[in-house]
């Protein structure tokens, strides 16, 4: 009887593991405003919070400005990027802006970077208005392997809204790879 | 043998519960157009459908214009807000608009409100065009505790698109809190 | 003893099934740029990749330009649509554009189509700027039945960005219907 029970318990433990009682990975990273790059060119954003306010991470790693996958799976990835300018923040050098976000995946095995999602808009921010604002949201479902890295690039980083509710990105695992 | 089986069944029931065979909470709430506030100021939207058309709710509560969490967990929250204006609706008070959405969390234990997500755009809706439209989408992954309330605030509520496919917000539980 | 074990194993297998060890359906479809319709009218986009680059599908079917549900459930649906124009592509027929996306559900039992989500913006793409870009993102949580079909309609399809990171839609099952 004990042997039979052990066999059932083994199945049960195996099921427990396969049923994702193991914690599903996730991350929600918010912009670290103390270190936003300047300029109008496209840059990779490397400073994000992972453990304060709404920011959190579990079973993923944040290192060198990149979100590193620790567990193979299909993940839903998302990003929300807000740009803003007030006339007191300096005079805009151009009214024609390209406000963009690119969510990229880098594989360290094959050192190459690929854009998973992009979004944004060209905007005409005239000096006639004292305040300008624009937000981008992107999201999608992707297969990620352990060791792959997710990063976020934006144009015009000096216009980023530094609030934690404004500029963030994240991921959560939805299911295993068959 | 019966005792052994009872022990295994106990484990099985426990696993079933832990495996989230209990229904995972969700909500998809669509705007109730019969009660949209007027004006151009920022207001909390309190009238939403939860049981008609695409609107639905399970293991969450909708009360007093807020979506109430009944079960601790990590949830994916989202909102889609559409604004529109046709010249037949009369002239806009101003051509320079700030069209914004704020998804907020209120804790009744600590009576304070915090913005989880924001999005939107400043727009110039000139009289040269007879129709104007703009949509905002935000989404993110957040830890929510039982009793916490989610609400949606917008600027310029009188410009909201009242269609159920246009203006809605929702949530679904992804995983437990460890 | 064997009878007891069989009974427990039966429960275990049933649980395994109910615990979604069966693969959860998903799809991420990217635009097939070789067959984008022309014109500025609203059209259904029928050419999507399902098995190259970021595009993938599992336990759902892609047929005749529509994503077909094979398994009842609650799904998170999303779409990201990018529009762009460069002056080298020729002059725009009009500077006032309505750039829109509609994610629709069709039921073959009741041959009718309903819009689940819409988004977009009216835009003024003036000849003063050599490049224009705009992206829309929509997402929401919906109950889908086996046999129902999801499709995407857009205005101004000739302006679509053909990159796989730009124009895509998808779905993933989150939970069963009770």
């Amino acid at each position: 009887i004990r042997a039979e029970k052990a066999m059932v318990d083994g199945s049960w433990l195996d099921l427990a593991k396969r049923s994702k009682l193991e914690a599903q990975p996730f991350a929600h990273l918010t912009i670290n405003a103390t270190d936003i790059p300047t300029g109008s060119h496209k840059v990779s954003l490397s400073s994000w919070y992972h453990d304060r306010g709404w920011a959190k991470i579990s079973n993923m790693t944040f290192s060198n400005g990149k979100l590193i996958v620790n567990q193979d799976g299909f993940y839903y990835l998302y990003a929300n990027i807000c740009f803003r300018h007030h006339e007191t923040s300096g005079d805009l050098a151009t009214e024609y802006l390209q406000l963009m976000v690119y969510v990229t995946k880098t594989s360290i095995k094959i050192p190459s970077s690929h854009t998973l999602m992009k979004g944004g808009s060209t905007k005409y921010w005239s000096g006639n208005s004292e305040f300008h604002f624009y937000s981008i949201n992107v999201g999608g479902f992707f297969k990620l392997r352990s060791g792959e890295e997710i990063s976020v690039e934006v144009s015009n980083p000096s216009l980023l809204d530094p609030d934690q509710d404004a500029t963030y990105f994240g991921a959560f695992k939805v299911r295993d790879i068959d | 043998i019966r005792a052994e089986k009872a022990m295994v069944d106990g484990s099985w029931l426990d696993l079933a519960k832990r495996s989230k065979l209990e229904a995972q909470p969700f909500a998809h709430l669509t705007i109730n157009a019969t009660d949209i506030p007027t004006g151009s100021h920022k207001v909390s939207l309190s009238s939403w459908y939860h049981d008609r058309g695409w609107a639905k709710i399970s293991n969450m509560t909708f009360s007093n214009g807020k979506l109430i969490v009944n079960q601790d967990g990590f949830y994916y929250l989202y909102a889609n807000i559409c604004f529109r204006h046709h010249e037949t609706s009369g002239d806009l008070a101003t051509e320079y608009l700030q069209l914004m959405v704020y998804v907020t969390k209120t804790s009744i234990k600590i009576p304070s409100s915090h913005t989880l997500m924001k999005g939107g755009s400043t727009k110039y809706w000139s009289g040269n065009s007879e129709f104007h439209f703009y949509s905002i989408n935000v989404g993110g992954f957040f830890k929510l505790r039982s009793g916490e309330e989610i609400s949606v605030e917008v600027s310029n509520p009188s410009l909201l698109d009242p269609d159920q496919d246009a203006t809605y917000f929702g949530a679904f539980k992804v995983r437990d809190i460890d | 003893i064997r009878a007891e074990k069989a009974m427990v194993d039966g429960s275990w297998l049933d649980l395994a099934k109910r615990s979604k060890l069966e693969a959860q359906p998903f799809a991420h479809l990217t635009i097939n740029a070789t067959d984008i319709p022309t014109g500025s009218h609203k059209v259904s986009l029928s050419s999507w990749y399902h098995d190259r680059g970021w595009a993938k599908i599992s336990n759902m079917t892609f047929s005749n330009g529509k994503l077909i549900v094979n398994q009842d459930g609650f799904y998170y649906l999303y779409a990201n649509i990018c529009f762009r124009h460069h002056e080298t592509s020729g002059d725009l027929a009009t500077e006032y554009l309505q750039l829109m996306v509609y994610v629709t559900k069709t039921s073959i039992k009741i041959p009718s189509s309903h819009t689940l989500m819409k988004g977009g913006s009216t835009k003024y793409w003036s000849g003063n700027s050599e490049f224009h870009f705009y992206s829309i993102n929509v997402g929401g949580f919906f109950k889908l039945r086996s046999g129902e079909e999801i499709s995407v309609e857009v205005s101004n399809p000739s302006l679509l960005d053909p990159d796989q990171d730009a124009t895509y839609f998808g779905a993933f099952k989150v939970r069963d219907i009770d």
Epitope: I36, T38, G39, S40, H41, H85, E87, T88, S89, G90, D91, L92, A93, T94, E95, Y96, L97, S126, G127, N128, N156, S158, L159 | - | N128
Partner: antibody, heavy 122, light 108 residues
Framework: EVQLLESGGGLVQPGGSLRLSCAAS????????MSWVRQAPGKGLEWVSG????????YYADSVKGRFTISRDNSKNTLYLQMNSLRAEDTAVYYC???????????????WGQGTLVTVSS | EIVLTQSPGTLSLSPGERATLSCRAS???????LAWYQQKPGQAPRLLIY???SRATGIPDRFSGSGSGTDFTLTISRLEPEDFAVFYC?????????FGQGTKVEIK
């Protein structure tokens, strides 16, 4: 090589008007914001006005707002400063300067022209 | 507007000595958006430093900038005869762009 050459300065009575020009060469003029900066005799530097590359947006110091107008003719690679209702305190060397074009907001000035002297006196 | 105060007003040093010039802002300068210029008599100003610490093209490495927030410094590690001039700081993180009143570095 980037070159900026101001002209149009001179002696003018209080309440009078003057139009300064700045001829630019050595760069794609229409792609860069431009500014005017002045320096009263023996004093420090003061930003006066700025304009975007397209000419669509203009900015002014409070001290000249409503009296001075900045403009540009991109077909002629020329920047202008129309100065009306001139006062004694507007007496200064007026420099035209190029924005670097590397930041989305107008930032530092590089290079500068050699300057043109405006004297407002009766 | 942001007021920039430079100190000292005049700095008397000999060639080969180290010069340290200070620029203090009335409020924090966003994004280290600060530049330094050199102006010699009868000439237009010349850009030395932008972004608080980045050297402009063609500027010798004896010129260096540092600081953030409200306190910024221009350092000339070893003064050369041609370095004696008036130096101005300028912020561009807030509108309007403003200059300090200048520091004169003269030969002792």
């Amino acid at each position: 090589e980037v070159q900026l050459l101001e002209s149009g300065g001179g002696l003018v009575q209080p309440g009078g008007s003057l139009r300064l020009s700045c001829a630019a060469s050595g760069f794609t003029f229409s792609s860069y914001a431009m500014s005017w900066v002045r320096q009263a005799p023996g004093k420090g530097l003061e930003w006066v006005s700025g304009i975007t590359g397209s000419g669509g947006s203009t900015y002014y110091a409070d001290s000249v707002k409503g009296r001075f107008t900045i403009s540009r003719d991109n077909s002629k690679n020329t920047l202008y400063l129309q100065m009306n209702s001139l006062r004694a305190e507007d007496t200064a060397v007026y420099y035209c300067a190029k924005d670097p074009g590397t930041t989305v907001i107008m930032s530092w000035f590089d290079p500068w022209g050699q300057g043109t002297l405006v004297t407002v006196s009766s | 507007e942001i007021v920039l105060t430079q100190s000292p007003g005049t700095l008397s040093l000999s060639p080969g000595e180290r010069a340290t010039l200070s620029c203090r802002a009335s409020q924090s300068v966003r994004g280290r958006y600060l530049a330094w210029y050199q102006q010699k008599p009868g000439q237009a100003p010349r850009l030395l430093i932008y972004g608080a610490s980045s050297r402009a093209t063609g500027i010798p490495d004896r010129f260096s900038g540092s600081g953030s927030g409200t306190d910024f410094t221009l350092t000339i590690s070893r003064l050369e005869p041609e370095d004696f001039a008036v130096f101005y700081c300028q912020q561009y993180g807030s509108s309007p762009r403003t200059f300090g009143q200048g520091t004169k570095v003269e030969i002792k």
